[in-house]
């Protein structure tokens, strides 16, 4: 195992004058020197103490010498005003040895029984020092048995000669644009034995400047020029200093972005130190003349390299550069003392054209053509066949650069098509039925493809229609030939439309019945609303008031006429509805499967036949005139009936539209 | 770092739309600047055809105002091209370009034949 | 629309010497000019922007002048990397235009 630290002899003991506890004899000089360990003390004291009093103890005495130093010289019994008896003190030596020293002179008046003393080495506490005397470390002092050592502070390192503590205190870098640095504990007085280098770095393009404050004592000498501790700059283009003493130097405008500050300082002294807050100034820029409309932030006196200045445009006007839109401008001021990006301007903000409605039309209210901020323009339908939704048409140009609805909408305002208008006021019949005259059926459509059907035409770009009729091209939609605003049914002159996508509803199943006949066309594009073209309206919730047991309903179509050809002339017919009840039993008996009318289904003929719908019908609508609205809406679509169309006892079964409004909305909103 | 990325079908149809878009990665279409599309028929000058601005407000050559429209998704850092009724003269390497043009992307070949 | 006429379209000059290209533009577009670079089958590349803004990380040599309708791109000792095409473009007005370019090529 490793030796633990050897410990020193243990050394203690006593002294006695010669013949103690007898008296002394004349004549004797007795010299003991006790020498301790190093880093130990001797301690002594008198247990008896009993010599002839003289004054200053020039006859009998024992003297304590430690050293060259004389540490008390003792005679008598008590202590007076020039002799020192020992009494109850302890007596330590100053270093590691002690010298006693006995002497008596050629005689004493009466006898004297001298003196007996006890000694022991005790460990030095180095880390204390009396009051006026250098302390012993120069920051933390640490005893121990033997001997001492020395510690520093964080920011300090240990000297070799172990007990100064130099500051570590180079290596700082201060880039900020101005600062202070200033020397170790100032302003108390700084370290001895250091060597400190503080460095400024700043940007290219930058100058520091230097300035001294508050106070600056440097130990110095009255001949030799600061031979102990000194300071001195020192920049790419020169050197300033050594600067020591105690008068403030000059303010040093280094011209430089990079300075080295050294300060050196020996073992001694003990001086305040010094103090810098240093600046940097740089090239200007030019001044920035903010544009017309248009600030500067923020404003400065002047603006050197890294100082940069932002635009900001009054309300309705915007930052450009030429033709090409700004959200913010910011300029940073270079080393050359040019600004990085030019000025920009603050033009007033141009909505530009606004964009053409279709089915309408635009109006510039502010003046012709004025299209800036706060220019107010007017969008209006085409009359008569078109509507526009909720939205008053009047848009102001913002400050954002967009036409603004006064609802806050950027969007432009929708033209409807108006429904639902006719120039039809009476009735006629199909099967049995009257010719229709032109713009009594708008909303009719042919359709074509494979069979002929029909379709009622919903807003501009829609056809309502049977499942039935479009079943076989639900996955060849573009195969659907679609015709309107025609009443010959053979005439070259109609407007053609296409269809993008059928929709059959998702409950209706071919060949099994026709509950859920109900299907929509979705136009590859929108026609162009006239009295000849006119979509229908789908029924308002409050439309089964117009659709009760025996009201008129009327329904259009090129389907068989009672010669068994298709018509060659558009025909329309007046039906009344029937009782749904009455129906459901027309139908029950053979050939008819029970159940073949639902509740998504409406009858509508006479009992006695004769009128009604027939096959080349099919997908037409069967309309009624909202009273209150003065429009006509859709209430069934020609679905189903008897083999033999206008036969007594039977009647025309259409899909029941009012039930299907969610399914058609949904379709409609969604695609 | 700011980049654009143009993608888009390299052929096209006559009288058909042609569709481009452009990816910007760096930097948010709507921070700031305006985005342009840039096209190089080949052989030829550069010719700007319109941008959309940090705001989503569009400027147009006026030579194409009848047929192109440039929009944006935001949420994808997108912006796009829509060319109509497009015809042989349409045949151009296609930029996207951020501003004055400090950032442009690599460009992307389109060619219009039946 | 504004004109911006190149010359000259073609430039032939030797490594190291200095090539000055010209830009006109047929009215005022104040200092709203860009010069850009471009080699074969690569996209431009901004070398100057406002008439004499030179972009970070563009080589000092590179350097633009002028406003109104006269402009001019100096480079000032041509190194082997720069023969390419050169654009002007003015972005001043509806519709944005760019120059012809002018080729330089070594000599």
């Known amino acids: 195992t490793p030796l633990g630290p050897k410990w020193p002899e243990p050394v203690f003991g006593r002294l006695a004058s010669p013949g103690f506890p007898g008296e002394y004899a004349n004549d004797q000089e007795r010299r003991w020197t006790l020498t301790a360990p190093p880093g130990y003390r001797l301690r002594l004291y008198f247990t008896h103490f009993d010599l002839e009093l003289s004054h200053l103890c020039e006859y009998d005495f024992v003297k304590l010498s430690s050293g060259a130093k004389v540490l008390a010289t003792l005679c008598g019994q008590e202590s007076t005003d020039t002799e020192r008896a020992p009494g109850k003190d302890t007596f330590y030596s100053l270093g590691s040895s002690l010298d006693i020293t006995f002497r008596s002179d050629y005689s004493n008046e009466k006898p004297f029984t001298g003196f007996e003393a006890f000694y022991a080495a005790e460990d030095i506490d180095e880390c204390q020092v009396a009051p006026g005397e250098a302390p012993t470390c120069d920051h933390h002092c640490h005893n121990h048995l033997g001997g001492f050592y020395c510690s520093c502070r964080a920011g300090y390192v240990l000297h070799r000669n172990k007990r100064t503590c130099s500051a570590l205190c180079s290596g700082q870098v201060f880039t900020q644009r101005s600062g202070e640095l200033s020397s170790p504990e100032y302003p108390r007085p700084y370290p001895k034995l250091s060597s400190c280098t503080y460095s400024i770095s700043l940007e290219e393009g930058f100058s520091v400047i230097l300035d001294f404050v508050e106070s600056f004592d440097v130990e110095t000498h009255p001949e030799t020029l600061c031979p102990y501790d000194f300071l001195k700059i020192q920049t790419d283009r020169e050197e300033h200093g050594p600067f020591c003493g105690k008068t403030l130097p000059h303010r040093i405008e280094t011209k430089s972005n990079t300075v080295t500050i050294t300060f050196v300082t020996d073992e001694s002294g003990d001086h305040t130190g010094w103090k810098i807050h240093y600046t940097s100034t740089a090239q200007p820029c030019p001044y920035p003349m903010a544009p017309p409309n248009g600030h500067v932030s923020p404003v400065q006196a002047k603006y050197i390299l890294k100082d940069s200045f932002s635009i900001f445009c009054e309300t309705g006007y915007e930052l450009l550069q030429g033709h090409l839109p700004l959200k913010s401008f910011t300029a940073v001021c270079q080393k050359d003392g040019s600004w990085d990006r030019p000025m920009p301007a603050c033009s007033i903000v141009d909505c530009g054209p606004p964009d053409d409605l279709p089915s309408g039309r635009v109006e510039y209210i502010t003046g012709p053509g004025v299209t800036t901020y706060k220019a107010v323009i007017q969008y209006s339908c085409e009359e008569t066949f078109y509507t526009m939704k909720v939205n008053d048409g009047k848009y102001v140009c913002e400050a954002d650069g967009f036409w603004t609805s006064s609802k806050g909408e950027k969007s432009l305002p929708v033209c409807e098509p108006v429904c639902g208008l006719s120039a039809r006021t009476t009735g006629g019949q199909i099967y049995g039925g009257q010719k229709a005259k032109p713009g009594d059926f708008p909303w009719q459509v042919l359709i074509l493809g494979g069979t002929t059907a029909a379709g009622a035409l919903l807003y501009d770009n829609w056809v309502l229609t049977a499942a039935h009729a479009v079943y076989e091209q639900k996955h060849d939609a573009s195969a659907l030939d679609i015709r309107m605003g025609t009443l010959k049914r053979l005439s070259p002159h109609y407007t053609q439309a296409w269809s993008e996508a059928v929709f059959i509803h998702e409950g209706y199943t071919h060949d099994a019945g026709f509950d859920n006949d109900i299907a929509l066309i979705k136009l590859n594009n929108k026609v162009v609303i006239n009295s000849n073209i006119t979509p229908i309206c789908l029924p308002r919730k409050e439309a089964e008031s117009f659709m009760r047991t025996d009201d008129i309903g009327t329904a259009s179509g090129w389907g068989l006429t009672q010669r068994g050809f298709l018509a060659r002339n558009l025909m329309y017919v007046d039906i009344p509805i029937v009782d749904h009840q009455k129906c459901t039993a027309a139908y029950e008996k053979p050939p008819y499967p029970r159940g073949s009318v639902t509740a998504n289904m409406l009858c509508a003929g006479l009992e006695s036949g004769g009128k009604d719908s027939c096959r080349g019908d099919s997908g037409g609508a069967l309309v009624f005139l909202d009273s209150e609205t003065e429009r006509w809406f859709v209430g069934g679509i020609v679905s189903w009936g008897s083999m033999n169309c206008g036969e007594a006892g039977q009647y025309g079964v259409y899909t029941k539209v009012i039930n299907y409004i969610p399914w058609i909305e949904n379709i409609i909103s969604d695609f | 770092q700011v980049q654009l990325q143009e993608s888009g079908p390299g052929l096209v149809k006559p009288s058909e739309t042609l569709s481009l878009t452009c990816t910007v990665s760096?930097?948010?279409?709507?921070?700031?600047?305006?985005w342009n599309w840039i096209r190089q028929p080949p052989g030829k000058k550069l010719e700007w055809m319109g941008y959309i601005s940090y705001s989503g407000r569009t400027s147009y050559n006026p030579s194409l105002k009848s047929r192109i429209t440039i929009s944006r998704d935001t949420s994808k850092n997108q912006f796009s091209l829509k060319l109509s009724s497009v015809t042989a003269a349409d045949t151009a390497v296609y930029y996207c370009s951020r501003h004055y043009g400090d950032y442009w992307g690599q460009g992307t070949l389109v060619t219009v034949s039946s | 629309e504004i004109v911006m006429t190149q010359s000259p379209a073609t430039l032939s000059v030797s490594p190291g010497e200095r090539a000055t290209l010209s830009c006109k533009a047929s009215?005022?577009?104040?200092?709203?000019v860009a010069w850009y670079q471009q080699k074969p089958g690569q996209s431009p590349r901004a070398l100057i922007y406002s008439a004499s803004y030179r972009y970070s990380g563009i080589p000092a040599r590179f350097s633009g002048s002028g406003s109104g309708t006269e402009f001019t791109l100096t480079i000032s000792s041509l190194q082997s990397e720069d023969f390419a095409v050169y654009f002007c473009h003015q972005y001043n007005a509806n519709p944005l235009t760019f120059g012809g370019g002018t080729k330089v090529e070594i000599k």
């Open positions: 760096g930097y948010s279409i709507t921070s700031d600047y305006a």
């Open positions: 009215q005022n577009v104040g200092t709203n």
